[in-house]
Amino acid sequence: KNSFTKLSIEPAFTPGPNIELQKDSDCCSCQEKWVGYRCNCYFISSEQKTWNESRHLCASQKSSLLQLQNTDELDFMSSSQQFYWIGLSYSEEHTAWLWENGSALSQYLFPSFETFNTKNCIAYNPNGNALDESCEDKNRYICKQQLI
Amino acid sequence: PSTLIQRHNNSSLNTRTQKARHCGHCPEEWITYSNSCYYIGKERRTWEESLLACTSKNSSLLSIDNEEEMKFLSIISPSSWIGVFRNSSHHPWVTMNGLAFKHEIKDSDNAELNCAVLQVNRLKSAQCGSSIIYHCKHKL
């Protein structure tokens, strides 16, 4: 039985070192093991972490937990059936669901957001589903870097 | 030792402002990953139709170069055709450039299943006439 030869000594699917792959391009230069799509870079984890751990892991890569612009943003992985932590949390101070950059959640993004438990964090499936779950649960996560 | 040429810059990420809304080396709406462009199809096609569809996009039907790429693609999509086939169960599995494909393909003993599909972290044989999602790849 043959198995594939590993091409990299980096452990699979942890945000890796800063590597420029498209050296001659004036466009997306995403780190190794990150996905470039529509001028954003995404790290799609295969490891499960709590929401806080996920947030810190993204921050350590100068990125943030996914902030969605619209439900089509992850169109390239809409067939995925995993749920991923995203950068949405409830602010008691503002009595609103806020993204990590402080902007408010659009009511059109998740029509059911009013039923979310405000003590929970939000796990998102790229098909458009969102669930509120205990922030101590371990889920995969998605980091995002905006290039423009 | 890694076969990748790695350039480290600990102080800042290697990013540049972009002029276009898509990546220069890849067609719009394709994704980049590890120095390749991928078209992530939503449409289901037979193996041969998928082959032609990728050719028309100046690319190849998905090829899998290593375990890590297989894991990544399995996260993106549960199953898709790959560019590996055989003429019959008595013939070897070959890639699109005619090279023998050495990696394990499940259910190879079934004579009706002569095209290969990636299915959640493993490679399987399937009926070439089945309608399955396809992805295309273009190495940068």
Epitope: Q48, T50, S79, Q81, Q82, F83, N120, N127, N129, L131, E133, S134, C135, E136, D137, K138 | P78, S79, V120, I132
Partner: antibody, heavy 120, light 107 residues
Framework: EVQLVESGGGLVQPGGSLRLSCAAS????????MNWVRQAPGKGLEWVST????????YYADSVKGRFTISRDNSKDTLYLQMNSLRAEDTAVYYC?????????????WGQGTLVTVSS | DIQMTQSPSSVSASVGDRVTITCRAS??????LAWYQQKSGKAPKLLIY???SLQIGVPSRFSGSGSGTDFTLTISSLQPEDFATYYC?????????FGQGTKLEIK
């Protein structure tokens, strides 16, 4: 080899309580959501409850909400179902089932089941 | 809640036959569908997940297809051990729901 072994079933009167257990082995229990699914005699399958990997999030079928409580002890690799205010219609074989690694809504391994009979 | 309707409720077939069972969801569930096989007095066994992905260890004569609301389980050439009851299940949203089952009997 993945194994799930249920216990705690038996005969109980309407209004009574019962606690089911499911001992897991052969996989990293704390990494997976777990489920209870039941099957009334001669009937089809009915999902009962799901608990997340850490135990922090739980989901219930409307038919058992407020009466049943799912929980887990990751240090003991054990899943529980506390059943209160039991009714005749809760009579069934109760299966514990592990969530699939690809997506948590699929059940890739099942226990052999434990029979709960609610009757006076 | 999403209702799952299987047809037929029972089917008689012979060894070597090709058998198709269908499952319809009351609303679109993309590809969030599983098929299970259950033999009398035994626990269910996962055959197919994500509508068409074959669970490891399941023979390739079993295949699944469909997306949205209409799904199919096909057994290409029936074997004696395939006579059982088959259930579909949606995993798109809570509460997870099963079809009523299709009993596959020997003709």
């Amino acid at each position: 080899e993945v194994q799930l072994v249920e216990s705690g079933g038996g005969l109980v009167q309407p209004g009574g309580s019962l606690r089911l257990s499911c001992a897991a082995s052969g996989f990293t229990f704390s990494s997976y959501a777990m489920n209870w699914v039941r099957q009334a005699p001669g009937k089809g399958l009915e999902w009962v409850s799901t608990i997340s990997n850490s135990g922090g999030t739980t989901y219930y079928a409307d038919s058992v909400k407020g009466r049943f409580t799912i929980s887990r002890d990751n240090s003991k690799d054990t899943l529980y179902l506390q059943m209160n205010s039991l009714r005749a219609e809760d009579t069934a074989v109760y299966y514990c089932a592990k969530a699939h690694y690809y997506a948590r809504g699929y059940f890739d391994y099942w226990g052999q089941g434990t029979l709960v009979t609610v009757s006076s | 809640d999403i209702q799952m309707t299987q047809s037929p409720s029972s089917v008689s077939a012979s060894v070597g036959d090709r058998v198709t069972i269908t499952c319809r969801a009351s609303q679109g569930i993309s590809s969030w569908l599983a098929w299970y096989q259950q033999k009398s007095g035994k626990a269910p066994k996962l055959l197919i997940y994500a509508a068409s992905s074959l669970q490891i260890g399941v023979p390739s004569r079993f295949s699944g297809s469909g997306s949205g609301t209409d799904f199919t389980l096909t057994i290409s050439s029936l074997q004696p051990e395939d006579f059982a009851t088959y259930y579909c299940q949606q995993a798109n949203s809570f509460p997870y729901t099963f079809g009523q089952g299709t009993k596959l009997e020997i003709k």
